[in-house]
Interface confidence: low
């Protein structure tokens, strides 16, 4: 059920190109491919690039994404398109320019002086942005999900943009100048993880991080179980960084526990997330447990 | 081509609805403004809806002004509570070929309708 | 509520002269600001858009720029029917929008 043709307009078409390329990466990373067969791999590529091509559609002239052509172009559309297709570089052929050509935007066009994006078009479809939706921190959250896209882009673009690794610095900055007053478990994972892969989550911050997590096995705030998977996702990719093997399993047993297999209404983010850390987790932790994770890979008919 | 109605004199206190009548085209693939000018004065922006229907308004317009799509070719603008200082000439206008109004524009715009709030 | 500052409130040309209308934005706004023409006893018409592209039917001497914050609106070669009432709008955000005062223009 990960596997899904993607359609419809600029989010909508990210919505369906999610599912497929989190699971052709999950698969690839732990080498679970002899389960299905590879010639489901290629059928998954296809619909890959398909949704790649489909997304050019809404590219704007000034390298930014939008819903339709015609709409303001969105900062977090735009950063997750970055997030996606950085995944996928090295899945198909992508056009470095429409990554990093989106890339500069967010900064020149999106990044204020104290270093937080800003969104001046909000995505039409808003379940989609998972736990950034109704946060009221939304600074914070905001620049934390763009400077994750911005760093997962980096080997990419850092030569073609000049500006980004000041950027990246800018970003950071404020983060860690807020990062003790936030209330929200969603917002100190997120910002926790976009620390930790600068090597900026440590002393107190580090200690707000790790005492945030409930029963030191998940990050969660009253409401949507979805964003609390998804916030338990940020923060696991960010002990995984921190190199914290000792708080990393039951961590990963809460996820597991969960039974999260992705798909649904407003799984976006969820999906995305859940699927990145625990590939992670297989790939860098020593001796990890084996997950037994419900992937299912049935190609959709033509 | 955009036509306003729904204007007229009415006492304070008293809610008013105006409609926006687009044709030549279809609000499901399209975004409505709505402005107002008083009396010798400057245009005040109001708020718009996109094509989903979602609406966004100015600070000073929020709780008391609500935009909504009633069908394929009509906006309504409800108001509430109106005062003296909300008499002025309404006008609905298109976002610039659908697009976001604030981002591409307004284009085209409706001649307008006049709303007097007097004792 | 301080988003635009227009500036002149009114100024006048000569045929074939220049006539250029400032916009200051309170903040960073980017490309978020068009500029209408409003004639009297009409409804507003956009000029420009995102900051320096020209509608669609607008004679090319009309000219949007943008410096930082401050936003021009240049008129070259004036003709008698760019008589009219010039107005920018400008948004930082959705709920923070606003156009400036408006800069009355008379042909001479």
């Known amino acids: 059920h990960l596997i899904v043709t993607p359609s419809g307009c600029g989010e909508q078409n990210m919505i369906g190109m999610t599912p497929t390329v989190i699971a052709v990466h999950y698969l690839d990373e732990t080498e679970q491919w002899e389960k299905f067969g590879l010639e489901k791999r290629q059928g998954a590529l296809e619909l890959i690039k398909k949704g790649y091509t489909q997304q050019l559609a809404f590219r704007q002239p000034s390298s930014a994404f939008a819903a339709f052509v015609k709409r303001a172009p969105s900062t977090w559309l735009t950063a997750y398109v970055v997030k996606v297709f950085s995944l996928a570089v090295n899945l198909i052929a992508i056009d470095s320019q429409v990554l990093c050509g989106a890339v500069k935007w967010l900064i020149l066009e999106k990044q204020k002086p104290d270093g937080v994006f800003q969104e001046d078009a909000p995505v039409i479809h808003q379940e989609m942005i998972g736990g950034l939706r109704n946060n009221n921190e939304k600074d914070m959250a905001l620049t934390a999900f763009v400077l994750i896209s911005l760093q997962e882009a980096k080997d990419i673009c850092e030569e073609q943009v000049n500006s980004l690794p000041g950027s990246i610095t800018k970003a950071g900055d404020f983060l860690e100048a807020n990062y003790m007053n936030l209330q929200r478990s969603y917002t100190v994972a997120i910002a926790g993880y976009a620390l930790a892969q600068m090597g900026r989550l440590k002393g107190p911050l580090l200690n707000k991080f790790l005492t945030t997590a409930k029963d030191k096995n998940r990050w969660e705030d009253p409401g949507k179980q979805l964003y609390n998977v998804e916030a338990t996702s940020y923060a696991l990719l960010a002990l995984l960084q921190l190199k914290d093997f000792d708080f990393v399993p039951p961590v990963v047993r809460w996820l597991n526990e969960q039974r999260y297999y992705g798909g649904g209404y407003g799984s976006t983010q969820a999906t995305f997330m859940v699927f990145q850390a625990l590939a992670q987790y297989q790939k860098d932790a020593p001796d990890h447990q084996e997950l037994n994770l419900d992937v299912s890979l049935q190609l959709p008919s033509r | 081509s955009l036509e306003e109605s729904g204007g007229r004199l009415v006492t304070p206190g008293t809610p008013l609805t105006l409609t926006c009548t687009v044709s030549g085209f279809s609000l499901s693939r399209y975004t409505m403004a709505w402005v107002r000018q008083a009396p010798g004065k400057g245009l005040e922006y109001i708020g718009w809806?996109?094509?989903?229907?979602?609406t966004y308004y100015a600070s000073w317009a929020k709780g008391r002004f609500t935009i909504s799509k009633t069908s394929s070719t009509t906006v309504d603008l409800k108001m509430t509570s109106l005062t003296t200082e909300d008499t002025a000439t309404y006008f609905c206008a298109s976002g610039n070929d659908g697009g976001d109004p604030l981002y591409y524009g307004m284009d085209p715009w409706g001649p307008g309708t006049l709303v007097t709030v007097s004792s | 509520d301080g988003v635009m500052t227009q500036t002149p409130s009114s100024t006048s040309a000569a045929v074939g002269g220049t006539v250029t209308i400032k916009c200051q934005a309170s903040q960073s706004i980017r490309s978020w600001l068009s500029w209408y023409q409003q004639k009297p006893g009409q409804p507003p018409k956009l000029l420009i858009y995102?900051?320096?592209k020209l509608a669609s039917g607008v004679p090319s001497r009309f000219k949007g720029s943008r410096s930082g914050t401050e936003y021009t609106l240049a008129i070259s070669g004036v003709q008698r029917e760019d008589a009219a009432t010039y107005y920018c709008l400008g948004s930082i955000a959705s709920d923070d929008t606003a156009f400036g005062a408006g800069t009355n223009v008379e042909i001479k």
């Open positions: 809806i996109d094509s989903s229907g979602s």
């Open positions: 995102e900051a320096s």
